[in-house]
């Protein structure tokens, strides 16, 4: 009778095992082992027992001990079970961002591993088991569907294999896939709200605001603001589930025309976009042209107003005839025209909006000097010792220099408060002088003596 020890062995792939073949008869003609495995005989004294080292065991095998005794030949098999953990445990790749409310299919693939009867595949969210199934097929595949929720954001999904050899006196061997970190998001169907000027003048700055509510996670939202090819650099303010992106936009003459303003919100693998047109225009203030800004009284003056070719102008409230970008008026300069403002107002229609621009020029009329009765009376009679202020106003542009002298030397203190004395009496020659010429006027001061009763 042939016996084998151990009759059953579980060993790691590539491992070695000692197998003892024994026979019950004392003098067997033959005692040995039949196996395709590499073997070594580990010699022992005696004839009825042989020990073999079987090495590099790569797969399940059934070496057979045999003996030939006087009472016949017999055999005994040992069952070698090879164990090895899977060579590949992998979750099928998925986009890391998943919209809330979507069904997500997790697929785990397992290559290799034995014995398959002891191999289980577990799909997990964190440490929570979602599905547990025996490994079947090559590669083994286990799938489960997860309804994506907001609170799944940042959750790690993984796949684990469990080769449970505890019933065989060994341990539980675990292999875990690389985790898949789920990023959940909510991007509302409503496009972002874009507030910006509809028209924008060249060489000015405008403010653009893009906002959207109902986002999750709002901090992960990317905002792209652009005017044509010009990328804007917004300052983004976040709320609980909203953001507001504010940017300054500067435009130059190169941007003139209709430009597309874009606000795109990207979250996860989705985006929402709002487009708006902004008309960029160039509209310089109208030009007011005076023949000469400074003329002498009586000179003929032409006032012209010129504006943008598509503008309509009014000059001093009078619309151009015919209505258009140019207007003019003619006048003979009078002293009353000195300091007169000529105002040109131009109106341009840009994208349905009326834009107004004004320009004002002042005319200087040179005249005088003038000394007249109203402003410089020819006669003053004042009581002696009274307080009086001699007044004499010379008119003209430029303002004349005024001197009133008695006998060519004694000045009358114009505009100053004086105590009237006998010395003040007399006739003064008032001379008003400017670049425009000079005029004179006689002024007499009479001093009344007090009556003594």
């Amino acid at each position: 009778q042939t016996s084998v020890s151990p009759s059953k062995v579980i060993l790691p792939r590539g491992g070695s095992v000692l197998v003892t073949c024994s026979t019950s008869c004392d003098q067997p003609k033959l005692l040995g082992i039949e196996t395709p495995l590499p073997k070594k005989e580990l010699l022992l004294p005696g004839n009825n027992r042989k020990v073999y080292e079987l090495s590099n065991v790569q797969e399940d095998s059934q070496p057979m001990c045999y003996s030939n005794c006087p009472d016949g030949q017999s055999t005994a098999k040992t069952f070698l079970t090879v164990y090895w953990t899977p060579e590949r445990v992998e979750l099928a790749p998925l986009p890391s961002w998943q919209p809330v409310g979507k069904n997500l299919t997790l697929r785990c693939q397992v290559e290799g591993g034995a014995p398959r009867a002891n191999l289980t595949v577990v799909l997990l969210r964190g440490e929570k088991e979602l599905k547990r199934e025996p490994a079947v097929g090559e590669p083994a595949e286990v799938t489960t569907t997860v309804l994506v929720r907001r609170d799944h954001h940042g959750a790690n999904f993984s796949c684990r294999t469990e080769l449970d050899l505890r019933p065989q006196g060994l341990e539980l061997f675990e292999n875990t896939s690389a985790p898949y970190q789920l990023q959940t998001f909510v991007l509302p169907a409503t496009p972002p709200q874009l507030v910006s000027p509809r028209v924008l003048e060249v060489d000015t700055q405008g403010t653009v605001v893009c906002s959207l509510d109902g986002l999750f996670p709002v901090s992960e939202a990317q905002v792209h603001l652009a005017l044509g090819d010009q990328r804007l650099n917004p300052t983004v303010t976040y709320g609980n589930d909203s953001f507001s992106a504010k940017a300054s936009v500067s435009v130059t003459a190169e941007d003139e025309g209709t430009q597309r303003l874009t606000c795109a919100v990207i979250l996860g693998n989705q985006s929402q976009e709002t487009l708006q047109t902004v008309t960029i225009y160039s509209f310089p203030a109208p030009n007011v042209i005076l023949t000469k800004p400074e003329v002498s009284e009586g000179t003929e003056v032409t006032v012209k107003c010129e504006a943008h070719p598509r503008a309509k102008v009014t000059l001093n409230g009078v619309p151009a005839q015919p209505l258009g970008p140019r207007a003019q008026l003619l006048l003979k300069a009078t002293p009353e025209d000195n300091g007169r403002s000529f105002s040109c107002s131009a109106t341009l229609e840009v994208a349905g909006q009326l834009i107004h621009k004004n320009q004002t020029r002042e005319l200087r009329v040179l005249y005088g000097p003038r000394l007249d009765e109203r402003d410089c009376p020819g006669n003053w009679t004042w009581p002696e010792n009274s307080q009086q202020t001699p007044m004499c106003q010379a008119w003209g542009n430029p303002l004349p220099e005024l001197k009133c002298l008695k006998d060519g030397t004694f000045p009358l203190p114009i505009g100053e408060s004086v105590t009237v004395t006998r010395d003040l009496e007399g006739t003064y020659l008032c001379r008003a002088r400017s670049t425009q010429g000079e005029v004179t006027r006689k002024v007499t001061v009479n001093v009344l003596s007090p009556r003594y009763e």
């Epitope: 070594k40 005989e41 580990l42 010699l43 022992l44 004294p45 020990v51 080292e53």
Partner: antibody, heavy 116, light 107 residues
Framework: EVQLVESGGGLVQPGGSLRLSCAAS????????IHWVRQAPGKGLEWVAR????????IYADSVKGRFTISGDDSKNTAYLQMNSLRAEDTAVYYC?????????WGQGTLVTVSS | DIQMTQSPSSLSASVGDRVTITCRAS??????LHWYQQKPGKAPKLLIY???QSISGVPSRFSGSGSGTDFTLTISSLQPEDFATYYC?????????FGQGTKVEIK
């Protein structure tokens, strides 16, 4: 009947070399493992080296690594221990023994004396 | 390296006595332990392999036990031919190592 016979021992000066032979009979050396074990005078046993004659895989004790070489010749069914750079502490009876994990059969031993 | 420590180093006993020799490994060696008997001027002789497995031709009074780190060789009834030095040896990992020996002498 399994038999192992060592030869080649003797007196050698420190730094010298010696080659020990182990002639096997009653079994084929490539079907098992051959080891050398030594015993210094009045001391215990010390494992020295092992060879798998089927593929010439060898393993050595740290004390002899780089100085001793174990080899086998299938055709002569003989194993060898080439000993170089011998030291006084290598003085011992050298046994050739067989089996894998235990030593079931031993030769009679050969004495190696390293002395000036 | 795994250190093997035998105790006692020597013992005196009478014929018929039950003798126990212990061997302790510095780390677990499962059952990869073997016992040898050596008489002066002779090569060692295998008595027990794999801690407890008997050898054909070795008297049944020799038995071995133990696993892990602690092992025992027992001679149930000491005979005159049993006076010798006994060694344990581990084959769990390289290098294989022997105990320092236990000398059994006549009392």
């Amino acid at each position: 009947e399994v038999q192992l016979v060592e030869s080649g021992g003797g007196l050698v000066q420190p730094g010298g070399s010696l080659r020990l032979s182990c002639a096997a009979s009653g079994f084929n050396i490539k079907d098992t493992y051959i080891h050398w074990v030594r015993q210094a005078p009045g001391k215990g046993l010390e494992w020295v080296a092992r060879i798998d004659p089927a593929n010439d895989n060898t393993i050595y004790a740290d004390s002899v690594k780089g100085r001793f070489t174990i080899s086998g010749d299938d055709s002569k069914n003989t194993a060898y221990l080439q000993m170089n750079s011998l030291r006084a502490e290598d003085t011992a009876v050298y046994y050739c023994t067989t089996s894998g994990y235990w030593f079931a059969y031993w030769g009679q031993g050969t004495l190696v004396t390293v002395s000036s | 390296d795994i250190q093997m420590t035998q105790s006692p180093s020597s013992l005196s006993a009478s014929v018929g006595d039950r003798v126990t020799i212990t061997c302790r490994a510095s780390q677990s060696i499962s059952n990869n332990l073997h016992w040898y008997q050596q008489k002066p001027g002779k090569a060692p002789k295998l008595l027990i392999y794999h801690a407890s497995q008997s050898i054909s031709g070795v008297p049944s009074r020799f038995s071995g036990s133990g696993s892990g780190t602690d092992f025992t060789l027992t001679i149930s009834s000491l005979q005159p031919e049993d006076f010798a030095t006994y060694y344990c040896q581990q084959s769990n990992s390289w290098p294989y190592t022997f105990g320092q020996g236990t000398k059994v002498e006549i009392k």
